[in-house]
């Protein structure tokens, strides 16, 4: 890979010194390094009106390196660029600029948003949610027995969180009222949520009202039905055999 040197070849300065410092192979008092020791990068730094040659193990910020056969040379990136692949392609912009497709911009183009962590223009990401999971069993105060009217809940997962300018996520919990055939609680039965239960078709006249609720919580006020239920549970001493609950699936 020998270089053929043209008429513009750099001539050695009259003050060329062999006693060079800092990785220089040849140098001059006026221009600093003129060439570097193997594997070091040659960079011209402007100091006032003068350009001083310096030899470094890698190119400084704002420069990129080219390993020619006869010289490793640092070339300046564009003024707004901190790290670049070459003159055309910046990979990290200086403070206050956003990187977009190899260019440094004051503001991100329409349809993109600034990521202030990476300082890049990125696509706006909208929220994505899964399909609803099935409704939970009809429960009341954590129990699945000893009541007629309760609530059931369903949830869905956030598949993709939105970026700053993206559409916000819709509610991920939904709670609605449900009516079941009252069944007595057996002694010690806790009837916790999540217990598998066969679902039957709704009884005539029974219905449920869907109440979307982003927090997935019913109102904390006690209804007359809830009070009645409590009293009945207190009065019960003898438990009947467990009845299967009937969940009503009509939604208005």
């Amino acid at each position: 890979q020998n270089a053929s040197r043209g008429r513009r070849q750099r001539r050695m300065h009259p003050n060329v010194s062999q006693g060079c410092q800092g990785g220089c192979a040849t140098c001059s008092d006026y221009n600093g390094c003129l060439s570097c020791k193997p594997r070091l990068f040659f960079v011209l730094e402007r100091i006032g009106m003068k350009q001083i040659g310096v030899c470094l193990s890698s190119c400084p910020s704002g420069y990129y390196g080219t390993r020619y056969p006869d010289i490793n040379k640092c070339t300046k990136c564009k003024a707004d660029c901190d790290t670049c692949f070459n003159k055309n392609f910046c990979t990290k912009c200086k403070s206050g600029f956003y990187l977009h497709l190899g260019k440094c911009l004051d503001n991100c183009p329409e349809g993109l948003e600034a990521n202030n962590h990476t300082m890049e223009c990125v696509n706006i990401v909208h929220c994505e949610v899964s399909e609803w999971n099935p409704w939970s069993p009809c429960t009341k105060k954590g129990k699945t027995c000893g009541f007629k009217r309760g609530t059931e809940t369903r949830v869905r997962e956030i598949m993709q969180h939105p970026s700053a300018k993206g559409n916000l996520c819709p509610p991920t919990n939904e709670t609605r009222k449900c009516t079941v055939q009252r069944k007595k609680c057996q002694k010690g039965e806790r009837g916790k949520k999540g217990r598998e239960r066969k679902r039957k078709k709704p009884n005539k006249g029974e219905s449920k009202e869907a109440i979307p609720d982003s927090k997935g919580l019913e109102s904390s006020k006690e209804t007359p039905e809830q009070r009645e239920n409590k009293q009945q549970q207190k009065k019960r001493k003898v438990q009947d055999k467990q009845q299967k609950s009937v969940s009503v699936s009509t939604v208005h």
Epitope: Q1, A3, S4, Q9, R67, Y68, D70, K87, F89
Partner: antibody, heavy 116, light 107 residues
Framework: EVQLVESGGGVVQPGRSLRLSCAAS????????MAWVRQAPGKGLEWVAT????????YFGDSVRGRFTISRDNSKNTLYLQMNSLRAEDTAVYYC?????????WGQGTMVTVSS | DIQMTQSPSSLSASVGDRVTITCLVS??????FVWYQQKPGKAPKLLIY???RLQDGVPSRFSGSGSGTDFTLTISSLQPEDFATYYC?????????FGQGTKLEIK
């Protein structure tokens, strides 16, 4: 819009010479190292030669060193490739390209056929 | 010189397929690596630079990854216009060297 337009290709006998030219526009020609890359029929890409931005240094691939010379005229935004002692294996499309680590801009290519 | 081993040399795929092309480099080149696309009778076009960065105008279905000696070009969902030949190139040092190319054909 960046444009690189090659010319000078054609059919030439082995041992003869040919000079390719490349007219550049749409970018600051004098800021860029320029190169020639060739592609033999049905084959891959092969780097031929690069000349640095100011014309002071040039580099050549092993297969052409000593036979080809690369030059440029920054006042005319033109790149040249002088090909001497041509061989059958030099038959290829020759592309003019701006070479800055990657080959960022390409011409449409000019075909050189070396045949007796 | 740095050697580039690109595989496969040819590949048949259908529209909508996910396709991966790999390039192995004979020495550590950090991320000084480029991918090109070439269509018949046309000049190569730079697709990806610095191993993973998309050139302006290149669709986001193209992506590049890797560092050191192993590099990959992925097309997430092939489109009719993607059937072409793809070349890798190391930009780490002279002489610049290319992979042998991968011809992507319609199945």
């Amino acid at each position: 819009e960046v444009q690189l337009v090659e010319s000078g290709g054609g059919v030439v006998q082995p041992g003869r010479s040919l000079r390719l030219s490349c007219a550049a526009s749409g970018f600051t020609f004098s800021d860029y190292d320029m190169a020639w890359v060739r592609q033999a029929p049905g084959k891959g890409l092969e780097w031929v030669a690069t000349i640095i931005y100011d014309g002071s240094r040039a580099y050549f691939g092993d297969s052409v060193r000593g036979r080809f010379t690369i030059s440029r005229d920054n006042s005319k935004n033109t790149l040249y490739l002088q090909m001497n002692s041509l061989r059958a294996e030099d038959t290829a499309v020759y592309y003019c390209t701006a070479h800055d680590r990657s080959f960022d801009y390409w011409g449409q290519g000019t075909m050189v056929t070396v045949s007796s | 010189d740095i050697q580039m081993t690109q595989s496969p040399s040819s590949l048949s795929a259908s529209v909508g397929d996910r396709v991966t092309i790999t390039c192995l480099v004979s020495e550590d080149i950090s991320n000084d690596f480029v991918w090109y696309q070439q269509k018949p009778g046309k000049a190569p076009k730079l697709l990806i630079y610095a191993a993973s960065r998309l050139q302006d105008g290149v669709p986001s279905r193209f992506s590049g990854s890797g560092s050191g000696t192993d590099f990959t070009l992925t097309i997430s969902s092939l489109q009719p216009e993607d059937f072409a030949t793809y070349y890798c190139q190391q930009s780490y040092k002279y002489p610049p060297t290319f992979g042998q190319g991968t011809k992507l054909e319609i199945k």
